[in-house]
Structures are given as C-alpha cells and as structure tokens.
Interface confidence: low
Amino acid sequence: DAHKSEVAHRFKDLGEENFKALVLIAFAQYLQQCPFEDHVKLVNEVTEFAKTCVADESAENCDKSLHTLFGDKLCTVATLRETYGEMADCCAKQEPERNECFLQHKDDNPNLPRLVRPEVDVMCTAFHDNEETFLKKYLYEIARRHPYFYAPELLFFAKRYKAAFTECCQAADKAACLLPKLDELRDEGKASSAKQRLKCASLQKFGERAFKAWAVARLSQRFPKAEFAEVSKLVTDLTKVHTECCHGDLLECADDRADLAKYICENQDSISSKLKECCEKPLLEKSHCIAEVENDEMPADLPSLAADFVESKDVCKNYAEAKDVFLGMFLYEYARRHPDYSVVLLLRLAKTYETTLEKCCAAADPHECYAKVFDEFKPLVEEPQNLIKQNCELFEQLGEYKFQNALLVRYTKKVPQVSTPTLVEVSRNLGKVGSKCCKHPEAKRMPCAEDYLSVVLNQLCVLHEKTPVSDRVTKCCTESLVNRRPCFSALEVDETYVPKEFNAETFTFHADICTLSEKERQIKKQTALVELVKHKPKATKEQLKAVMDDFAAFVEKCCKADDKETCFAEEGKKLVAASQAALGL
C-alpha cells in the first residue's frame, strides 16, 4: 500500500519512542565515530520533521524516501571528511547508490575504546538523573560497536536494560542485583549480534536464495506441523524483514517484524502448538520469544521421503517444472523430519540432491541414475557427528580454557597470517561450543554445535574481509556458505608460512596483569600462546604445554611477590630464555 509520506507512515506505525530509538540506532550504525550528542541532535531534527509530516503528509519533502531523508541528514555532519575519510564521498552520490555506499563503509571492528563499566552507584545516579539519556546512550554504544545488530531486538535488550536498573537501583545490595543481569545482557547481546551478522552476510554475500534456503530449513525444523505453503509464506516475510534490517531500513524492518509476529500469533493453530505463551506477551517480548521458540513435535506417521523424492517416476518432471519450489519442498520435508540435524547439514544434503538431479535428469535413464541419491547423504551426516563426538570428548577431558587453547593452536597453525587478536577472539568463541552444546543429548548436539560454529566462523570471515591476509581464509569464507566449517576443519598446517621473528617485547609482562579479571588474564595468556605458535608453528603440543605451564607459574609467583614489577622484569627474562630453549627458538 502506497503512502504519501513514508516517514509519517512509519512514525504512526511505530510510535514516537520506537521511531526515535530506531533512527538513533540507524545513525549510530552508519556513523560509528560520531559523538553521542551529535547523533541525538540529528535524531531530534528528524523526529520534528516526521511530526510535521504526520500533521500534513503533503508538506514539503514529506514525500521523500527514508533513505533520502536520512542520507541528507547524515551528510550534514560537518566533520564527515576528517572523521570518516572516503566515506564522505558517499554524499556525492544519489540514492540508492548513496545508501549502498554507507552500507559498504560499515566497520565490523571499529576503532572504539572498550566499554568500561562504571561503579554501580555511579550508574544508578546517572539512571535516576536522566533515564531517557541513559537508555539512549546504551542504544548508541551498542549500535556503533555492532553495526549489524538486529535493531528491533536491540529495543528488546534496551527494555531489559531499563528493567534491570529500575529494579536493582532500589535494591539493598545494588551490585549483587545488577551485575549478574548486566553480564547476562552483555553475553546475550554479543551472541545476538553475531547471529544477525551471519544472516546479513548470508543475504549480502550469497544472495536471497541462500537466506531463504536457510530459513526454510530452520522454520521447517521449528514448525514441522505447518504446511509447506505456510512455511513458504513465513520464509518470504522473514526474508523481507532481514533484508530490510541488513540494508539499514530499520523502521520498515521493525514495522514488518511486528506484522510478522502478529500474523504468526493469529495463525498459530496452523503453525505450531508451542507459540501460546509467546503470543500472550507484549510486542518486543513476543517477537523475541517467537524467534527463540522450541521446536514443535513432529507429526506422527510422516511417510518415507523416498516415495516422493527418489521412487516416484515424476521426480524429474516435478523438478523441471519449478526447480526452486521442488527443492524447497525437499528441504522442508527433510528438515521437519530431522530436528537432530544442523541447518547447514540439511542445506548440504539439499545441495547434493540438487546436483544429482541436475546430472541425472539429463541422463538416458534418470531413475536409475538418482536411485541411490540418499546413500550419498550418509558420509555428509557422519562427518559432523564424528567431529562433534571427538571435540566433546576433548572438551570434557580438558575443560573450557584448555579446550580453547587447543583450538587456538589448531587454528593458528591452519591460518597463521590472521591477526593475533582475531585468532584469540575467534578461538575463544569456538571453544565455547563445548560448554554450550556438549551438555545436550545426542539429538540436540549437532544443531547446537554446527550452527553455532557457523556463526563464529562468520565472525572470522567478516573480520578477515576488512584486512585480508590469508588466501585460505578467503577461500573457505567465499566458496560456499554451508561448507565453511568443513572447509576450515579440513585445513592442515600451513606449510608455506614463514615463522615470525622472535620479539622479546611480545613476551614481556608487567604487574598490571595481576589486577586483571580471570577472563582478561586468560586472554593475555592466550595471546602469548598464539604468538608462540606464530614463532614456532612446528612446536609440539607437549612443548607448548610446558611453556604455558611455566608461564602460568611465573604469573602466579610474581603476583604474590612483594615487589611485583621487579619480579616480572627478572623472572620474565628467565622465562623467555627457558622458552626459547624449550622450543629451539
């Protein structure tokens, strides 16, 4: 339905509070370096303009597209050239090229200071003094650090953030109440950001068809009682929502997400029996709940897949008539029967099936040619099953920290050209798969583990894309979305790598390490481990373990010493010498 004024339409649909919050998120995700106050000023100007359009949709400029209005506003920032360099060139372009240009300049790893959490009393005072500014600042800081964060979901996080302060700032022990809630929001927020980043990468790098295939598989697992036509409708709508959010169209995205939640709840009888509780919640909670809802029970007595997709004489006819529809039905039927498979495995099976039909439907005897297609699935299913079994055994044997270290060594040897901070971040996250998924029963392990690994490896891919240093990473990241994990798993030690020069400075530590949290101390040690492997890629597990054990003992000893700094200086030299000897550096 066409509206005379798009900005008035969205303002009325979303309400002033959500409109302002979403415009702030959009602006912060585009101009990640701009000060908070500048963004607030721009948002207020846009909001006042929107109100004039609500009052009179025929008013001047009210008929302009949101991209035109927002882009014009962003291009008024005086310091654009000095702060953003070539991004300022976007302003010379016309829509839609200008928006595409802004999108291309989004930075997954912006050079911003780490967010330091103030004392609880300081935060509570700031919250009480000006609640609105306090919450806007939260949206701004998250959005600028996570330029692809799913905007309607960030509104849900902000709502929880506000609730945490409202409750805890009047509690007897404010810190005991607030800090665990903030930790939970931080961890969930990072996970949510990474999951959305994969959706955007899927759409932007591999196209709508790839995203739709992912959505068909996931929604069919989640809603196995829904008809194919129903799943297709949900997939189309969901694709529109994510295309909009990934494209910076946050007002449209939030509006359409609300419509989709409404549709799902109005039609839950034909979608899933698990939606009742979700649908009783307010909008933001409802949408979040639906997105996380557990899989419905599979319908009883589903017929064998082979009848329609292998034994039928009409396979090639049906495939030729509407390829994507037929493959979509295959994926739907396979996924609804297999909640125990990862989405990426289901997509690999569908791709194998498609390749077989492409080949066989042109053969002299198509049926004879594709009769054994399901046999080709067996090794594809067994590969992730075996990998998860082996890695869960290793995780249970080592615990999370040492399991992360094993992965750090493994991945540094595979792609030693990648920056140390990226290797540490990615390997730490890969290692979290253990505590996240290995506790699950067999039937839930693979969807948990492999789909989580897809999210983490996408982090590696987007960080690497900013400054490409390894052909192997580029190859695994770009060749096939669903085969990224098998591609990285298959990489062996990079024999072409020239070891890094030894630099004693890299292994020089100071007393400040003693005041770090356990997590930060682990990161310091893991950074040293990556650097060791980069110096000595052929070092054995035993050699590396010995050096790391010595290192841990050294840190512990010096942190207990009276003169910590002297201890770190003197014992540090001895440790470097001993490590060089142990590794033959």
Partner: nanobody, 117 residues
Framework: QVQLVESGGGLVQPGGSLRLSCAAS????????MSWVRQAPAKGPERVSA????????IYADSVKGRFTISRDNAKNTLYLQMNSLKPEDTAVYYC??????????PGQGTQVTVSS
C-alpha cells in the same frame, strides 16, 4: 503443470527500450519471488533482476542498475521487465524463473532480445 511464457523481445537500436512480460500459470504465483535471467551466446546464465513475492523487494545486477525495472502484477499472474537505454551487451535470451534460480523453472523458451544498429 508450471508454465512460464516470456514475450516482448525483439530487435532494437542502442538506447532503445523494450518491455518483457512473463505469464505464469500452474502454481501460486503470488507466493513466490521471481527472477529475470539472461543468457548470451557462449556465456553462462546471469540473473538480471529479482523481485519478492509481494513486489516490495527488488534486486538488480550492477550491469543493469538504473536502466532496468522489474515489477509484477499478482492479480494477472504476470512478471515484467522494463528495459531502457539498451546496449549491445544486453543482447541475450531472457527468461523468467521462480525464486532466484538461474536455471529455467518451466518449459518456456525465453524471449530473444537483440540490440544492434
């Protein structure tokens, strides 16, 4: 049976315009995204443009951005491609497909577009 019948092609001079149509039947047209794909002699298929099921989302190949416009009329079960400022390199067989496939979805033969002076 799924049927996609393309029409509207022809011979046109550089800078000229054509409007291609694709009449669809045998499936619920309004439920599926659609694409226009072209194949030039001795070249692989190239997706020119795609449109979402309700017509709200569109995608264009860089080579045709600003010159081609995809649209659809779900009431008439018809997909369109308006081609302006045509160039010799737009010469190809154009066919429509269901979803975003670059392989023909039905038995349609496509429609030949030739841009030449």
């Amino acid at each position: 049976q799924v049927q996609l019948v393309e029409s509207g092609g022809g011979l046109v001079q550089p800078g000229g315009s054509l409007r291609l149509s694709c009449a669809a039947s045998g499936f619920t047209f309004g439920q599926f995204g659609m694409s226009w794909v072209r194949q030039a002699p001795a070249k692989g298929p190239e997706r020119v443009s795609a449109i979402s099921s309700d017509g709200s989302g569109t995608i264009y190949a860089d080579s045709v951005k600003g010159r081609f416009t995809i649209s659809r009329d779900n009431a008439k079960n018809t997909l369109y491609l308006q081609m302006n400022s045509l160039k010799p390199e737009d010469t190809a067989v154009y066919y429509c497909t269901i979803g975003s496939s670059t392989t023909p979805s039905g038995p349609g033969q496509g429609t030949q577009v030739t841009v030449s002076s």
